[in-house]
Interface confidence: low
Amino acid sequence: FKNDATEILYSHVVKPVPAHPSSNSTLNQARNGGRHFSNTGLDRNTRVQVGCRELRSTKYISDGQCTSISPLKELVCAGECLPLPVLPNWIGGGYGTKYWSRRSSQEWRCVNDKTRTQRIQLQCQDGSTRTYKITVVTACKCKRYTRQHNESSHNFESMSPAKPVQHHRERKRASKSSKHSMS
């Protein structure tokens, strides 16, 4: 038996909400690395970028016993960055794809740019509440990586408890259960 102040929070992406809800493809972009083809009338085989994908994610946070009272909204930075879109009204549009041709040794990826710390309240089945400090993504950016660079995946589990109201809390095991019937 161990009783200490360590708690690990686990989040569950419950319902990813696309930045443009009318497009069903947005969700798939997040799952497939964010690659996207422009629908501006260009040949669909011409790979161009529609901008760094900022997908809006709605998720509930859980520590294994208690769940956030309301869903947390944050951005998910999706996939690989290619050039800005070659739109008809883009200045110098004719040169876009050629100028941004993908080099074999490097690639651009959409990564977290800005984050902020916010407090989130979790509610337990017995009615008690806990407050945690978590980091949420507020903006994305394109970053150049070499081929050898290891991809650093976005980690939804990098949350730390705020100063606990009480000193002793149960240490949670690593479980990604969505079962929150605990009382």
């Epitope: 016993q65 208690c66 337990c124 017995d126 009615g127 509440t129 095991r173 479980s175 009382s183």
Partner: antibody, heavy 121, light 112 residues
């Protein structure tokens, strides 16, 4: 020291209303949910539900939906159980309880002394 | 709801005896986080129940080491190694893995 002090015994007639209080001390009232447990004479324990002392939102176990109401007076660190339209089967001792920790994963460590409600014509 | 079945309902003992109470749940009490939220309480006449054991085998503060809990899944046992006079009363098992919290009917430990 953590204390849950409940109001005294009540003798009521069927159809009447009773309101039991539970005054908490020795801890931050709005940090821990408050539950209520019923014990009929010579019987076992039955969890009635709980009230979120932070938000004031009550949750009732299925058998206690309708005539039962949990409420709070946060400024007085007091939780209330109100039973409307009393029936004979409501005769019981009612306990307000609090978990050892933020939830009941480590059991119900803190119990009020109980309030006996007797319903009799 | 999870049904908690205690046996025996009555347990006559002599002081100094070992006593054993069984508690069986209608479904597994192992939570998906790996913990099992099975607890034992003792209620003496005219008093509120008191927490003895939490999470199967952990003694609550101030509880003598003659009390021990064991079990897993759906089958649990409370043992008193040497019964003392102050141990007499009604023992309840309870689960808080599933909502609503439920209790066993109780086992009355009394002198023979």
């Amino acid at each position: 020291q953590i204390h849950l002090v409940q109001s005294g015994p009540e003798l009521k007639k069927p159809g009447e209303t009773v309101k039991i209080s539970c005054k908490a001390s020795g801890f931050s009232f709005t940090t821990y949910g408050m539950s209520w447990v019923k014990q009929a004479p010579g019987k076992g324990l039955k969890w009635m539900g709980w009230i979120n002392t932070y938000s004031g939102v009550p949750t009732y176990a299925d058998d206690f939906k309708g005539r039962f109401a949990f409420s709070l007076e946060t400024s007085a660190s007091t939780a209330y159980l109100q039973i409307n339209n009393l029936k004979n089967e409501d005769t019981a001792t009612y306990f307000c309880v609090r978990g050892r920790e933020y939830y009941y994963g480590s059991g119900i460590a803190f119990w009020g002394q109980g309030t006996l409600v007797t319903v009799s014509a | 709801d999870v049904v908690m079945t205690q046996t025996p309902l009555s347990l006559p003992v002599s002081l100094g005896d070992q006593a054993s109470i069984s508690c069986r749940s209608s479904q597994s009490l192992e939570h998906s986080n790996g913990n099992t939220y099975l607890h034992w309480y003792l209620q003496k006449p005219g008093q509120s129940p008191k927490l003895l054991i939490y999470k199967v085998s952990n003694r609550f503060s101030g509880v003598p080491d003659r009390f021990s809990g064991s079990g897993s899944g759906t089958d649990f046992t409370l043992k008193i190694s040497r019964v003392e006079a102050e141990d007499l009363g009604v023992y309840f098992c309870s689960q808080s893995t599933h909502v609503p919290l439920t209790f066993g009917a109780g086992t009355k430990v009394e002198l023979k």
